[in-house]
Structures are given as structure tokens and as C-alpha cells.
């Protein structure tokens, strides 16, 4: 086909000789053509719709990629001749750097359904060269990691040695989709979630007297986990006193948040303090009530069959521990004013004689 009508874009890949890095070309078909083949969200906000009608397609066919040999030979089908280049929907992925990737790459829809479609193509002139050794030592890596739950940033490798003030306007893409919220050489992430992982592309324009080039770099971002630096946090009980009715059953719940630990051995137990005595209570097994990649919330209840007068003189303590340290929360029971009659009080006193049976000591839970 005649490629003279294709829109043209010049790209520069300055690769680091010290690292393995990838490169990506997007098939930037004009609007509305592109929307039929790629995600609309890939388009830059400055693109103006082209009014040529373009055949609609319900099954969103892929685009076809070609490489134009420099000697004027016919176009080569990428898939047949270049095993290190992977074609995926509207992107072309170069798995290995090298000046041999320099050349012209053409993309167009696979399915040509109208006379207008013939001119629907993009020619990308790619120049590939090794980064000069004069480049700064601490340039950002093409593989960057973000710690889950913390703050972090993703830096554009080709601009990481420049201050934010001197940095040109940058266009960012994540997994092929335009990120319109930032034009800086760094994406700041307030809190890292798993969805922040992916393939990021940063583009900026470099101009000389003769022409203008888009300098592009690709960053693989992983979200990583690490052991918490915090002791567990008791979420419940919040109050140190609890109003109760004598003679009635009572359940006190202890809920605690444990931060991520690669080797997870949470301890959660209830014990009772009575004057100078202190003993651990046999209570139902702890259970995980919410688990995320960042933390886990565990609950364990203490159950009193009937609240007695003696219980009002005791302190109920929830104890939680991880490898960093422990946290406790004490609860004192307080009789509800105006609650219960004489029968309840007699019943509660009767139970006091048997209450030692309720508490067996030493029970550990390991999650």
C-alpha cells in the first residue's frame, strides 16, 4: 500500500547500556479512526478529531505493523521477521534495546473497509542510540518499585537528572492509556495500591533547528510488600469502661489491625486482672474479619455467661502482639444505673460461687 499519505511521528529511544529495558510504540491513528481500534483513553487531550468517516467495527480489529527497510525494499511484516518485537493490539513492544531497532515502523488497520481507510496509517521514524556516558549516575531505573501502603513516586528515566523546574512538559501513559493528571517528570503517589503496578511510558518533546522528536522511555512498575514497622493497633474496644447489666450475658469483642508481615504470627488474647492476680482466659478462637494485601483485622471475643458483682471489680485486658511489639486495651465494667431488679442481683451472687470454673488459663493463638 502507499505509505506517502501516512501521518508521521519521530521518536527517540536513548537506551541505557547498563540495564535491560523495553520500548513501546503506540499506533496513534487519528480520531475518529483510532477509537475504532484502540482505547479512546489513549488519545492525548490535544488531538483534534479528523472528520474523515472511518468504517465502524464492532469487534475492534487489531492493527497491522510493518517495518520499512532503509533500502526501499517492500514493507516487512513485523511478526515474521523480528522475534524480539511483540505486536499487541495497538502497541509494538521491543523486548531488547539496540541500534538495530532504528528504522521506520508503519501501522494501519488490519481490516480496510472503505476507500478512506487506505490513508488511515501512521509512520513512526524511530531512532535508537545508547545513552551517552556523560548522563548522570543516579538516573531513574526502567524498573521501579512502589511499597504498598506507603507514599512513592515514578520517575521518567530520561529526565530524572533534571530538577522539576527545568523539566519539559511530560506526557505519561499507563498500560497504554493516557494519564492526564500529571505533566511533570515524576508521578507522585500519595498511597500505593496494587493497581499502581503496570507499564508506564513517559514522552517529552526535544527540538533542534531542523526537527522535533518525541523522546520516550518505558518504566515497569511493581507494587511490593514489606514488613510493618508498627505494633498492632487495637480498633475495639475504644472505651476503657463498659456499662453492663448484672446477671445478663456479655460479650466483649477485641478487634486489632495487624500490618503485613512476611512471617505472620499474630498473638491475641484476653486476660483478667483482679487485685494482685492476673490470668489468661480461655476464649473462642480468634478469627480474621478482614484481610487485605496491606493488613489484616483479627477479632477475638471474651464471653461472660452472666455478669457478676465480682466482674465489676475486675479489669478485662485484650493483649495483641506481633514481631514489633505489643499493645493492650483494658476494659472496666460498670453497672448500668437503674438496670436489673433484686432477682438479677441474687442470681449474680449465686453465680459468683461457681465462677472459677469459667476461667481456664493459658491459651495461645497463632494465626
Amino acid at each position: 500500500f502507499n505509505i506517502s499519505g501516512c501521518s508521521t511521528k519521530k521518536l527517540l529511544w536513548a537506551y541505557s547500556t547498563r540495564s535491560e529495558e523495553e520500548f513501546i510504540l503506540f499506533c496513534d491513528l487519528p480520531e475518529p479512526q483510532k477509537s475504532h481500534f484502540c482505547h479512546r483513553s489513549q488519545l492525548s487531550p490535544t488531538q483534534v478529531p479528523d472528520h474523515l468517516p472511518f468504517t465502524d467495527s464492532k469487534d475492534l480489529p487489531d492493527v497491522q505493523w510493518y517495518r520499512q527497510p532503509s533500502n526501499g525494499d517492500p514493507l516487512e511484516d513485523i511478526r515474521k521477521s523480528y522475534p524480539h518485537i511483540i505486536q499487541d493490539k495497538c502497541t509494538l513492544r521491543f523486548l531488547t534495546p539496540g541500534v538495530n531497532n532504528t528504522g521506520s515502523y508503519i501501522c494501519r488497520p488490519k481490516m480496510i473497509k472503505s476507500p478512506y481507510d487506505v490513508a488511515c496509517c501512521v509512520k513512526m521514524i524511530l531512532e535508537v542510540k545508547p545513552q551517552s556516558n556523560a548522563s548522570c549516575e543516579n538516573s531513574a531505573s526502567h524498573k521501579q518499585d512502589l511499597l504498598l501502603g506507603s507514599t512513592g513516586s515514578i520517575s521518567c528515566p530520561s529526565l530524572s537528572c533534571q530538577s522539576d523546574a527545568q523539566s519539559p512538559e511530560v506526557t505519561w501513559y499507563k498500560n497504554g492509556k493516557l494519564l492526564s493528571m500529571t505533566r511533570s517528570n515524576r508521578i507522585v503517589v500519595d498511597e500505593v495500591y496494587i493497581y499502581h503496578q503496570g507499564t508506564y511510558v513517559c514522552d517529552y518533546t526535544q527540538s533542534d533547528t531542523a526537527s522535533s522528536w518525541t523522546v520516550r522511555a518505558v518504566v515497569q512498575v511493581r507494587t511490593i510488600v514489606g514488613d510493618t514497622k508498627l505494633k498492632p493497633d487495637i480498633l475495639d474496644p475504644v472505651e476503657s469502661t463498659l456499662e453492663v447489666e448484672l446477671g445478663k450475658p456479655l460479650t466483649i469483642s477485641c478487634k486489632a489491625r495487624f500490618g503485613f508481615e512476611r512471617v505472620f504470627n499474630p498473638v491475641m488474647k484476653w486476660y483478667i486482672k483482679d487485685a494482685d492476680l492476673e490470668w489468661e482466659v480461655s476464649v473462642p478462637e480468634a478469627k480474621s474479619i478482614k484481610s487485605t494485601l496491606k493488613d489484616e483485622i483479627i477479632e477475638r471475643n471474651i464471653i461472660l455467661e452472666k455478669v457478676t458483682q465480682r466482674d465489676l471489680r475486675r479489669t478485662f485486658v485484650c493483649f495483641v502482639q506481633n514481631s514489633i511489639g505489643n499493645t493492650t486495651q483494658s476494659v472496666q465494667l460498670k453497672e448500668k444505673r437503674g438496670s436489673g431488679g433484686l432477682n438479677d442481683i441474687f442470681e449474680a451472687q449465686k453465680i459468683e460461687w461457681h465462677e472459677t470454673v469459667r476461667f481456664q488459663s493459658h491459651h495461645h493463638h497463632h494465626h
Epitope: 511499597l147 511490593i224 510488600v225 514489606g226 512476611r262 494485601l293
Partner: antibody
Framework: QVQLQESGPGLVKPSETLSLTCTVS????????WSWIRQPPGKGLEWIGY???????NYNPSLKSRVTISVDTSKNQFSLKLSSVTAADTAVYYC??????????????????WGQGTTVTVSS | AIQLTQSPSSLSASVGDRVTITCRAS??????LAWYQQKPGKAPKFLIY???SLESGVPSRFSGSGSGTDFTLTISSLQPEDFATYYC?????????FGQGTRLEIK
């Protein structure tokens, strides 16, 4: 790019303590786990233990009583001490970055960057 | 400790051959398995994680499969630089353990 370099004596006497240091360059020690692995001559790989940059450790039970791994974030270094060594501790000792990667609803761990290894011989 | 048994212990093959190495765990480890390549006098190099995911920069001729107790590493078309020793590693439970290795030699 992150690079690791092991350093320490190549010869240790039996019953003494083997001490090695791994220096991390081209990146931060923060946010990662750091492991020690060894390989006796002509044999396979044996994991010794890891430390998280904040200081939490986990050791191979077969060596636990003799191993201490520590970290110095200010120097971007972590260290291995193995006490009461015998000839069976003769090996190439590697340090590695041991990263926990979050994926969907789980994690996987990989040793994605390794030092070039240092040979330690235990002999009198 | 979970034991990983690799088979074969060694094999000879030619450039262009398709090669499969297996790794069997003594108990289920889900997909918590990685593969490493080690050349003589060098440190191991990480190839595959989570049983089947290829590390970026690793040639696509390498692939991994399996979950539970049985895993395989396949090299679809051997290249001269692929002759090395391959190790599987589990991180499902502690201690972390490695297979005994499979030595891949030129026929």
C-alpha cells in the same frame, strides 16, 4: 541499576565466626528484604536467611542457632555472621535482594538481584 | 521443610532443541515457585516467578507452567547461551528451599 557486592575474609578457622558484608549500590536498601544464600562446592543452593530493611529477620531452622543477619541502612549494607564454623560451611556465599511482589490477592517472592558471590573456606 | 526434586539431574541437547525440566514439590505449594539459571562461576539469574510469569528481559523462548506439586520449565528452541544449570525455588513456606539443579549440556 542495583548492584550487590559481598566482602569478607576468604579463609576462616574451624570454630570461629564467619563474617560477611553485602554492600548495595545503585539503589536503596529501603523497602526490600535481603537474603543470604550459600552453595557448597559442586552442590546446590541453600537459603540461610533474610532481613527486612527495618530489621525483622527469618532464618533457616537448620542454621538458626548459629546465624545472625543485621542491617545498616545508613551505609546501605547488610551482614551475615555464622558462628562455630566447620568444614561443612565451606561454600560460595551470595547476597541477594529478596523482593515481595504484590499480585492480585497474593504475594510472590523472588531473588531478583544477586551479588557475584564470595568463596569462604573453613580450614585450619 | 518442603523438598523440591528436579528431573532430570542432567541432560544433553542441541541448539534449536525443545527442552523440558520438571520440578516436583513434596507438598502443595500453590504457584509459589521461581526458576533460576546459573552459569559456571556466576551467580544465579532469576527467570520465572509465580510458576509461569516471565521476568521482563528474559527471552520468550523460556516458559513455565504448573501449580500445586508439579512444575515445568520449557525452553522452546535452545540457544548457545542457554547451556547452564537450572534451579527451581519454593517460597510457599519456610525455610525457602531450592531443587538440586538440572545441568543442561551441549550434545
Amino acid at each position: 541499576q542495583v548492584q550487590l557486592q559481598e566482602s569478607g575474609p576468604g579463609l576462616v578457622k574451624p570454630s570461629e565466626t564467619l563474617s560477611l558484608t553485602c554492600t548495595v549500590s545503585g539503589g536503596s536498601i529501603n523497602n526490600y528484604y535481603w537474603s543470604w544464600i550459600r552453595q557448597p562446592p559442586g552442590k546446590g543452593l541453600e537459603w540461610i536467611g533474610y532481613i527486612f530493611y527495618s530489621g525483622t529477620t527469618n532464618y533457616n531452622p537448620s542454621l538458626k542457632s548459629r546465624v545472625t543477619i543485621s542491617v545498616d541502612t545508613s551505609k546501605n549494607q547488610f551482614s551475615l555472621k555464622l558462628s562455630s564454623v566447620t568444614a561443612a560451611d565451606t561454600a560460595v556465599y551470595y547476597c541477594a535482594r529478596d523482593v515481595g511482589i504484590a499480585a492480585r490477592n497474593s504475594y510472590y517472592y523472588v531473588m531478583d538481584v544477586w551479588g557475584q558471590g564470595t568463596t569462604v573456606t573453613v580450614s585450619s | 521443610a518442603i523438598q523440591l526434586t528436579q528431573s532430570p539431574s542432567s541432560l544433553s541437547a542441541s541448539v534449536g532443541d525443545r527442552v523440558t525440566i520438571t520440578c516436583r514439590a513434596s507438598q502443595g505449594i500453590s504457584s509459589a515457585l521461581a526458576w533460576y539459571q546459573q552459569k559456571p562461576g556466576k551467580a544465579p539469574k532469576f527467570l520465572i516467578y509465580e510458576g509461569s510469569s516471565l521476568e521482563s528481559g528474559v527471552p520468550s523462548r523460556f516458559s513455565g507452567s504448573g501449580s500445586g506439586t508439579d512444575f515445568t520449565l520449557t525452553i522452546s528452541s535452545l540457544q548457545p547461551e542457554d547451556f547452564a544449570t537450572y534451579y527451581c525455588q519454593q517460597f510457599n513456606s519456610y525455610p525457602i528451599t531450592f531443587g538440586q539443579g538440572t545441568r543442561l549440556e551441549i550434545k
